[in-house]
């Protein structure tokens, strides 16, 4: 069945109650640098209203602080209000290292986001921090490994790995959830001039990712105990007609095309799926598209295998397909698949349709194909054009967390968070945030704050506390970590 | 290594057509785009347009349209340009140069230039 | 389609000195959040070589006294001081919209 009547109960003590957010530009200076001048001046103020220095007098300056960063303020000020436990955002790599490589590091840009974890610990919201996060409009590396071919050039992995690494150790005592790269399996809408470019880009992304994870276990867990994956964007696949088995076929390979392409070497064999490589040898084979996926040797195989300390899921919404035999060399030719709007469903302005028992058969099939493991929702949400009452969000967020509550309560998946997209909206753009790009709240903070406050949706005599111990003991680690590193 | 090797020069009376070839090798062929670019005797440097060999998609300046075809040949990695009805003002010097779709788009490798001579 | 203009057609310069050649795109070649703006050198009789990528990296095996900056429309190639070797014509380009237009060239002379 689709839908099924709304349940009440609780997520567990230790959920993860996140908002994400996506690249954070590092400011380059505090914007407060008024407490660092040691000079007394004297302000004219009937005259010709300037400030006049008073030579002879030095004031005690105070040291620069984090709050210093006006940036960092204003996100103080809005993760306090969401009430949250966790906050996922996004390094910029070109700006930590702008040469590609450790020659020249940008001290002040780890500052700054030592600056933005470490005041947060300081109000009780924990960092998922994610090293690298392409979007469409910006594929977000340093220049120089931009020109040397991108994500096509096998040394961008190696590139990566030594970025990985200056992040944990800068970071690492203060982050314990990682995310590597954000939605790999989106940056085929950038590299996407042929299939070959599409899997040869995708290969060096798992590799870039292992090699990270790899490093993360060898020389970072023994003190730093964190856990590290990668965000996979994992839509749900809908037949769009229930009755014909090629959209039933087809809505299984959009999943193995979209997902199991990363999941599958990551999560479990260390190859590609069976299924995707063969349907895209069998369309070479009849003269349809020349796209082939890499062969992997033995030792990629066994670099990549097991390479996830938990499942990370970006999900927005489920789509409806279709089989149609396309050809051409290209990704989206590959798989053979239509999408079909469905106009009876509710949807966004960016036409995204609420769909709310997708996200239950998605974290159903991710266990049943790559076992029981940890499963965070490291981003969801929708775009909602209301700059004070979104109810399009509140509908989404209940809806789509109810169904996250049947997944642990009655299919007991092992759910350990959930991220709300996003924090604040960017200007001209579609609007997912909670507060508008001028700072503003919408309404959707104070449902979403009730729903973390509940713990979900509960019994109206269950306590939503959670036992006293539980709570002093995350307290004492952020007071602990906060103190190890100013 | 990356090369970019240009057949050679070339005399052509008015009206007549050539075509110039750039042999690619020390990289898949397939992935990178392969641009041409004239210069005029003691003039700059005109870009003509682009192929990418994967595809065969093509790209031009506005200037050279229908007078410039550009062509390739996966299995010989070899990108062609063809002029059709030359005049005295095409003789130049044509280069050809890799640039990178999802890179810096900049030139970094360039054949070594094939002078075309139109003269009656 | 954007046009891009150099400034000074030639440039004569003493051994040592500082030259500056500039360029000017009729609009931004920014996007994406790269500036897709590049220098190229060119000497008698042979193909041009890139200097300059992205508007300030230097290209690899490129000595570190020629300089790239600029953004938005205004470019500047620096050589900070000038060699005997680097007399040549100096061209700059974009590749912003996936056309990949020319400068006019600057010739730079040793005075």
């Known amino acids: 069945k689709e839908s099924t009547p709304d349940v009440q109960g609780q997520f567990p003590c230790d959920f993860s109650w996140g908002v994400t957010e996506s690249v954070l530009k590092p400011e380059s200076v505090a914007s407060s640098p008024q407490f660092s001048d040691p000079h007394l001046y004297v302000w004219n103020a009937t005259g010709n209203r300037l400030l006049h220095r008073v030579e002879g007098v030095r004031l005690k300056t105070r040291p620069a602080q984090c709050t210093d960063f006006v940036n960092i303020k204003k996100q103080l000020e809005m993760l306090a209000r969401m009430k949250v436990t966790h906050y996922r955002f996004a390094l910029d790599w070109a700006s930590v290292l702008p040469t590609g490589n450790l020659s020249a590091v940008n001290r002040q840009a780890l500052r700054y986001y030592r600056c933005v974890v470490s005041e947060g610990l300081k109000l009780g919201i924990s960092a998922m921090v994610t090293l690298y996060y392409p979007t469409h409009a910006h594929l977000g590396l340093p220049e120089p490994l931009l020109h040397a071919d991108g994500w096509l050039n096998p040394s961008t992995a190696e590139a990566f790995q030594a970025y990985a690494g200056l992040c944990f150790q800068e970071l690492g005592d203060l982050v314990k959830l990682w995310i590597t790269i954000n939605e790999p399996n989106r940056l085929s809408d950038i590299y996407n001039r042929s299939g070959n470019d599409t899997y040869g880009a995708a290969h060096n992304l798992l590799v870039a990712h292992a090699l990270a994870w790899r490093l993360y276990d060898r020389q970072f867990r023994p003190s730093q105990r964190g856990a590290v994956s990668l965000s996979l964007h994992a839509d749900w696949a809908e037949p769009a007609n229930p009755y014909a088995d090629s959209h039933w076929r087809a809505a299984e390979r959009f999943l193995q095309f979209e997902i199991a392409w990363f999941a599958e070497p990551l999560f479990k064999t260390g190859d590609y799926p069976a299924a995707m490589r063969e349907y895209i040898a069998s369309k070479h084979r009849r003269g349809l598209s020349s796209s082939a996926l890499p062969r992997l040797t033995e030792a990629e195989r066994r670099l990549l295998k097991g390479t996830v300390d938990f499942c990370a899921l970006n999900h927005f919404t489920t789509r409806f397909v279709m089989h149609e035999q396309l050809a051409g060399s290209r990704y989206d030719s590959d798989r053979d698949i239509q999408f079909l709007q469905d106009i009876t469903r509710l949807s966004s302005p960016t036409r995204l349709a609420v769909i709310p028992w997708g996200v239950r058969k998605l974290l159903r099939w991710v266990r049943r194909n790559y076992g029981d493991m940890d499963i965070y929702i490291t981003a969801s949400g929708i775009d909602d054009q209301a700059l004070e009452d979104d109810r399009l969000r509140k509908y989404y967020l209940g809806k789509y967390l109810q169904e996250v509550l049947k997944a642990y309560l009655i299919d007991k998946v092992r759910i350990k968070g959930y991220y709300a997209f996003k924090l604040a909206e960017e200007k001209s753009k579609p609007r997912f945030g909670f507060f508008t790009s001028d700072f503003k709240a919408k309404s959707s903070i104070q449902f979403y704050n009730k729903v973390i406050s509940s713990r979900g949706f509960p019994f109206e005599n269950s306590s939503s506390r959670c036992s006293q111990t539980q709570e002093n003991t995350e307290c004492t680690v952020c007071l602990f970590l906060v103190q190890k590193k100013p | 290594q990356v090369q970019l090797q240009q057949s050679g020069a070339e005399v052509k009376k008015p009206g007549a057509s050539v075509k110039v070839s750039c042999k690619a090798s020390g990289y898949t062929f397939t992935s990178y785009d392969i641009n041409w670019v004239r210069q005029a005797p003691g003039q700059g440097l005109e870009w003509i347009g682009w192929?990418?060999?994967?595809?065969?998609?093509?790209k031009y300046n506005e200037k050279f349209k229908g007078k410039a075809t550009i062509t390739r040949d996966t299995s010989a990695s070899t990108a062609y340009m063809e002029l059709s009805s030359l005049r005295s003002e095409d003789t130049a010097v044509y280069f050809c140069?890799?640039?990178?779709?999802?890179?810096?788009?900049?030139?970094?490798?360039w054949g070594q230039g094939t002078l075309v001579t139109v003269s009656s | 389609d954007i046009v891009m203009t150099q400034s000074p057609d030639s440039l004569a310069v003493s051994l040592g000195e500082r030259a500056t050649i500039n360029c000017r795109a009729s609009?931004?070649?920014?996007?994406?959040?790269?500036?897709?703006m590049h220098w190229y050198q060119q000497k008698p009789g042979q193909p041009p070589k890139l200097l300059i990528y992205?508007?300030?990296y230097l290209e690899s095996g490129v000595p570190d006294r020629f300089s790239g900056s600029g953004s938005g429309t205004d470019f500047t190639l620096t050589i900070s001081s000038v060699q005997a070797e680097d007399v040549a014509v100096y061209y700059c380009q974009h590749s912003r919209d996936l056309t990949f237009p020319f400068g006019g060239g600057t010739k730079l002379e040793i005075k």
């Open positions: 609009k931004s070649v920014s996007t994406s959040g790269y500036v897709y």
């Open positions: 992205l508007a300030s």
């Open positions: 192929i990418y060999p994967g595809d065969g998609s093509t």
């Open positions: 140069a890799r640039s990178d779709y999802y890179g810096s788009r900049s030139f970094a490798y």
